[in-house]
C-alpha cells in the first residue's frame, strides 16, 4: 500500500475581499483512518480552521460531501474574506487514536492573498 | 520538458487485436494516474480507461469493459492499452494523458500526448 | 451514470465578444470533479478549468469558470482569435469520467 499523501495543488489563491476563497486539499489513499483539519499557519500558534470530526466553523463549507464513502477530497470553501484572512493555509491528515488522533501528515501549504474589493 | 508519446496505432481488421503505448518522460510517472482516451472521426472526446500511479487499480468504460486492458510499467515510464476483439466503432484517435495531480481522477488531465491512430476496418 | 450535456453546439461570436458556455449534469456533483478543456483542430486537448473554476498553469484570466451541483458555466470575457475552437467539460472523482459533447467556438 502506497503511504498517503496530503496534496495542496495551489501554492497560492487570490481572493477579493467579500468573496469566497476555495482551498484544495485530498488525499492519495484512504489508509490511515482518521479526521482531517485545515490550519492557518504553523507551529504551536497555529489557528483550527475547520475540524471535519467537531466544531462549528460558520464561514466553511465543504466542496465534497466529507462523509461519502471512499470520499478522498476535502477541500474547503471559506466565505466573505477579509484581509484579516491573509496567511498560509494547511490541510492535515490526522490518525485515529486513543484517548487523542495524532498528526499524521501535512499538506504543503496554500498561501491566500486578499485584494482590496473592487469598487 | 513533460511529454507523452503515443505509438502502435494502425490498421486492423475486426475482431482483431492491438498494443497501444504511451511514453512518459519530464515526470515522475509512477506518482501519478494515467488515462486513455479517444476521440472518433468527427467527433468528441471519450474517456476510455484509468490507472492509479502503482498500477493497483484500473477503470474502464462500459464501452471497452471486458475487450480493453490498462496496464503500465513503471520502470519503464510505459502506460499501456492493450485492445482486443475490436470493433468498427473503436476506429479514432487514442491519446494518453497524465492526472493533473497524485490523487486520482481529482482535477483534470493536465498533459496529452498528441496521439496514435487506430483503424478497424475489414 | 451522470450525463453531461453542453449546450449551445455551436457559437458563433465575434473577437471580443464574450462567450458563454453551459455544462449540464444529469444529477448533482462536486464542484471538484468538474474540468473544462479546449481543443483545436489537429491538436491535443488542454485542461482550460480545474475544480469548476481554477485556472490551470498558463490560462490566460479571460478564461473563467463557475457553478455548482447541476450547473456549470465556462466563459471567456473577450474572444480572441485564438480561442475559436472545441470545449469540452468533464466529469472526474467517479468512473466512467464522462465528458460532455462538446460546444464549438466558430467566427461569425
Known amino acids: 500500500e502506497d503511504e498517503l499523501q496530503v496534496i495542496q495543488p495551489e501554492k497560492s489563491v487570490s481572493v477579493a475581499a467579500g468573496e469566497s476563497a476555495t482551498l484544495r486539499c485530498a488525499m492519495t489513499s484512504l489508509i490511515p483512518v482518521g479526521p482531517i483539519m485545515w490550519f492557518r499557519g504553523a507551529g504551536a500558534g497555529r489557528e483550527l480552521i475547520y475540524n471535519q470530526k467537531e466544531g462549528h466553523f460558520p464561514r466553511v463549507t465543504t466542496v465534497s460531501e466529507l462523509t461519502k464513502r471512499n470520499n478522498l477530497d476535502f477541500s474547503i470553501s471559506i466565505s466573505n474574506i477579509t484581509p484579516a484572512d491573509a496567511g498560509t493555509y494547511y490541510c492535515v491528515k490526522f490518525r485515529k487514536g486513543s484517548p487523542d488522533d495524532v498528526e499524521f501528515k501535512s499538506g504543503a501549504g496554500t498561501e491566500l492573498s486578499v485584494r482590496a474589493k473592487p469598487s | 520538458q513533460v511529454q507523452l508519446v503515443e505509438s502502435g496505432g494502425g490498421v486492423v481488421q475486426p475482431g482483431r487485436s492491438l498494443r497501444l503505448s504511451c511514453a512518459a518522460s519530464?515526470?515522475?510517472?509512477?506518482?501519478?494516474?494515467m488515462n486513455w482516451v479517444r476521440q472518433a472521426p468527427g467527433k468528441g472526446l471519450e474517456w476510455v480507461s484509468a490507472?492509479?500511479?502503482?498500477?493497483?487499480?484500473?477503470f474502464y468504460a462500459d464501452s471497452v469493459k471486458g475487450r480493453f486492458t490498462i496496464s503500465r510499467d513503471n520502470s519503464k515510464n510505459t502506460l499501456y492499452l492493450q485492445m482486443n476483439s475490436l470493433r468498427a466503432e473503436d476506429t479514432a484517435v487514442y491519446y494518453c494523458?497524465?492526472?493533473?495531480?497524485?490523487?486520482?481522477?481529482?482535477?483534470?488531465?493536465?498533459?496529452w500526448g498528441q496521439g496514435t491512430t487506430v483503424t478497424v476496418s475489414s | 451514470e451522470i450525463v453531461m450535456t453542453q449546450s449551445p453546439g455551436t457559437l458563433s461570436l465575434s473577437p471580443g465578444e464574450r462567450a458563454t458556455l453551459s455544462c449540464r449534469a444529469s444529477?448533482?456533483?462536486?464542484?471538484?470533479?468538474l474540468a473544462w478543456y479546449q481543443q483545436k483542430p489537429g491538436q491535443a486537448p488542454r485542461l482550460l478549468i480545474y475544480?469548476?473554476?481554477s485556472r490551470a498553469t498558463g490560462i490566460p484570466d479571460r478564461f473563467s469558470g463557475s457553478g455548482s451541483g447541476t450547473d456549470f458555466t465556462l466563459t471567456i470575457s473577450r474572444l480572441e482569435p485564438e480561442d475559436f475552437a472545441v470545449y469540452y467539460c468533464?466529469?472526474?472523482?467517479?468512473?466512467?469520467?464522462?465528458f460532455g459533447g462538446g460546444t464549438k467556438v466558430e467566427i461569425k
Open positions: 494523458a497524465k492526472d493533473f495531480t497524485e490523487v486520482v481522477g481529482w482535477l483534470g488531465m493536465d498533459v
Open positions: 519530464g515526470f515522475t510517472f509512477g506518482s501519478f494516474g
Open positions: 490507472i492509479t500511479a502503482s498500477g493497483g487499480s484500473t
Open positions: 444529477q448533482s456533483v462536486s464542484s471538484s470533479y
Open positions: 475544480g469548476a473554476s
Open positions: 468533464q466529469l472526474l472523482g467517479s468512473s466512467p469520467r464522462t
